[in-house]
């Protein structure tokens, strides 16, 4: 084994060092001294350290770590954070996109029907925002409350024009009718089944998205703990306190420190490996009715075929709506 | 090529639907950060090593700092000494997880149930029967997938890989992304998000 | 076109505080991280700090710590810094930058503002 | 923190001249994943700091190709083949590899 070098007779090497980390040398003994108060840097011999210089070291030290950490997940962080506000902002797109077109397949084929079916579908669309970013929504009634919003409109304007604008009673009928006739056949089961699969994936991916940025948050700020901090500060600092400036520390025994010092670390290993194949499959699912983008682009031309779907039946239901709904038209004709 | 309404407009009750291509879509950007992502799966494990080798760390020096003092980079002491008489590091490791670590291993446990339990499993039936109640049967055929889009009257069925975000043009090209080493034109960085 | 428009020169009485702000366009604001640089005579360059605005994440230079305040407001695109208890040695200017992780850290700047500390 | 020490301070050159400076790091800057994150600037009087050169060789879009950029580990060296008096100004390197980001002191570019 070498011999240690001779500790500085003066501290002033130490003193000249520890001047970078705290200005105001007052910590930094003018000579070695028998350091007996130093919890950390244990002295063999005299020391150039005192306890308040260990206490700043363990404080650099664990400045140093969060440095390192943060350092390391910068491109990671980087590539999640970027992609969650791409993807947040293209399904707002993709939504502002469904509504325009359907709004415009309103204004094309059913003009009598605008003002009110631009009404219910942006009411509808502002809940299919909300509901990819997290609101408590059901997919299903947002759907059923497009068609029974819809379905008055068409039957007062489109079915049945001699009624006058005012039949608020029998527009509850009418509601109720919607879906004890199936009037609109099987296209609002349709459309529940094709957006709430495709919102749902959707949702999950964001949220899966946001949670990656929240582990590496996480991990990014971890408080280390006391024994970490101690064992950093022996590693990284301790030297110094013998004048050994330029010396390094042994790369086998950093590796045992790091790997005792981020054992909690290394336990999200396994769920980060999962979490990143889960998410895997998932996209590799995200087509078709899986696919937001798809569906609800789409759902202008859905939504035209179950309007064509109710004009095609309008004498049946008519007639059978007529006599459903004949006590709240007779209060309406008075 | 992917049909989408760009410009509606009526032309004998039918409706037109022009179609733009770009590049890129989003199923094509999903499947890319997933690529990108998979190249960070061992980052966890491999963090210690990580930052042991981005801090100084006797490299080709002969002697080294142990915790205590210095020794050949070689030898038994290297790795043993500073270890002992100061903390026990097996205890370290048996303390477990810190609490917010236990919490955020909870919710990725939680994410990866859920995202399985979404997953799609290959080749899987789609619900069929939706044309069995009602009036009549609706226009669609009885995968609901061909639904999408409709066959009403002139109506263009709307296909998979939608190509038309160049409305978020913002410059988030090549170079944005990490991974990535090409290099990018000013033009490059204005026309179209979804193109890396 | 990516466009950072910085607030207009301060000048500013020692102990006061000042704000300035950094408005974007051309880019997906939420979709990078906005950092800071300080400019002081003597061509020295020092790195303030960065901040996400997808969610306000953010990282400071110890050097800066206590010093600045990094903000963000989402509904107009800008990013803010706060810089408390001036003295004279924080006259400088003041640059933001957009930041990209990949490839460059940092291809787009401010035109900066400058800030100056004077009773 | 990493400190980048530039040379020269100043370096008056004749216009079509090569001119080179150096930077250098105290420590690695390779990146966790690889990639070192090294790059210059630069600033023209009155001007904002303008991308030059990224991850140590990448010259950035509209950049001319009489700057080139080498180095890897500690050693850097920004090149200009033809010094033209669009040039003159104030060059600095930055490594954003570990926090926190760090710039050399700057070189100061100008005509002999």
């Known amino acids: 084994q070498p011999p240690p070098p001779p500790p500085d007779a003066t501290c002033h090497q130490v003193r000249s060092f520890f001047q970078r980390l705290q200005p105001g040398l007052k910590w930094v003994p003018e000579t070695p001294v028998p350091g007996s108060d130093l919890q950390v840097c244990l002295p063999k011999g005299p020391t150039c350290c005192s306890r308040k210089m260990e206490e700043k070291y363990q404080l650099t030290a664990r400045l140093n770590m969060e440095q390192l950490l943060q350092s390391a997940s910068m491109e990671l962080k980087f590539l999640i954070i970027q992609n969650a506000a791409v993807f947040q902002e293209a399904f707002e797109i993709v939504v502002r996109h469904a509504k325009n077109y359907t709004n415009a397949m309103f204004k094309n084929n059913y003009p009598s029907l605008t003002p009110q079916a631009f009404e219910f579908v942006g009411e509808f669309f502002t809940d299919v925002s909300l509901y990819i970013l997290g609101s408590d929504i059901n997919v299903d009634d947002m759907v059923n409350e497009l068609f029974d919003s819809l379905f008055p409109v068409i039957y007062t304007q489109l079915m049945n024009p001699g009624l006058p604008d005012s039949a608020l009673d029998i527009n509850e009928c009418l509601r109720g009718a919607r879906r004890d006739l199936k009037v609109f056949g099987n296209f609002p089961k349709l459309i529940m089944t094709q957006v709430s699969k495709s919102l749902q994936v959707t949702r999950i991916f964001l949220q899966a998205l946001n949670l990656g940025i929240e582990v590496i948050n996480t991990t990014d700020h971890l408080k280390f703990s006391k024994d970490c901090g101690r064992m950093l500060t022996r590693m990284w600092y301790c030297s110094y306190c013998q004048g050994l400036m330029m010396v390094k520390p042994c790369g086998g025994y950093c590796n045992v420190v790091m790997q005792g010092c981020m054992a909690g670390v290394v336990e999200i290993d396994k769920y980060w490996r999962e979490y990143i194949l889960s998410l895997e499959e998932l996209v590799n699912g995200m087509y078709r009715i899986y696919d937001m983008e798809n569906v609800l682009l789409g759902l202008f031309s859905t939504i035209h075929d179950s309007i064509q779907y109710v004009q095609k039946n309008a004498g049946k239901l008519t007639t059978t709506i007529g006599k459903l709904c004949a006590h709240s038209q007779q209060r309406q004709y008075r | 090529s992917a049909y989408y309404p760009e410009d509606l407009f009526i032309d004998k009750k039918v409706l037109k639907v022009a179609h733009v291509e770009h590049e890129e879509t989003l199923s094509s950007r999903r499947r890319e950060l997933i690529q990108k992502l998979k190249s960070f799966i061992s980052f966890y494990s491999a963090l210690p090593g990580y930052i042991c080798s981005h801090s100084p760390v006797a490299e080709n020096d002969t002697l080294c700092w142990n915790g205590q003092e210095l020794v050949e980079r070689y030898s038994q002491k290297a790795a043993r000494n500073g270890m002992k008489n100061q903390f026990n590091l097996h205890e370290l490791k048996m303390k477990g997880p810190e609490p917010v670590v236990s919490q955020i291993i909870d919710k990725l446990k939680h994410i990866n149930q859920l995202l399985r339990t979404m997953s799609v499993p290959k080749g899987r039936v789609l619900d069929k029967n939706l044309d069995e109640e009602g009036f009549e049967s609706g226009d669609c055929g009885d995968d609901e997938d061909e639904c999408i889009g409709g066959s009403g009257d002139g109506m263009m069925k709307v296909k998979n890989q939608l190509r038309f975000l160049a409305e978020l043009a913002y410059d988030l090209d090549v170079d944005d992304v990490p991974g990535n080493n090409q290099q990018a034109t000013p033009k490059d960085n204005e026309i179209s998000t979804f193109h890396n | 076109e990516v466009q950072l428009q910085q607030s207009g020169p301060e000048l500013v009485k020692p102990g006061a505080s000042v704000k300035i702000s950094c408005k974007t366009s051309g880019f997906l604001f939420t979709g990078h991280y906005m950092h800071w640089v300080k400019s002081s005579h003597g061509n020295i360059l020092d790195w303030i700090g960065y901040?996400?605005?997808?969610?306000?994440?953010?990282f400071y230079n110890q050097k800066f710590k206590g010093k600045a305040t990094l903000t963000v407001d989402k509904s107009s695109n800008t990013a803010y810094m706060e810089l408390r208890s001036l003295t004279s040695e924080d006259s400088a200017v003041y640059y933001c930058a957009r930041g990209d992780y990949g490839n460059y850290v940092t291809a787009y700047w401010g035109q900066g503002t400058l800030v100056t500390v004077s009773a | 923190d990493v400190l980048m020490t530039q040379t020269p301070l100043s370096l008056p050159v004749s216009l079509g001249d090569q001119a080179s400076i150096s930077c250098r790091s105290s420590q690695s800057i390779v990146h966790s994943s690889g990639n070192t994150y090294l790059e210059w600037y630069l600033q023209k009087p009155g001007q904002s700091p303008k991308l030059l050169i990224y991850?140590?060789?990448n010259r950035f879009s509209g950049v001319p190709d009489r700057f080139s950029g080498s180095g890897s580990g500690t050693d850097f060296t920004l090149k200009i083949s033809r010094v033209e008096a669009e040039d003159l100004g104030v060059y600095y390197c930055?490594?954003?590899?570990?926090?926190?980001?760090?710039f050399g002191g700057g070189t100061k570019l100008d005509i002999k």
């Open positions: 991850k140590v060789s």
């Open positions: 930055f490594q954003g590899s570990h926090l926190p980001w760090t």
């Open positions: 901040i996400y605005p997808y969610n306000a994440i953010s």
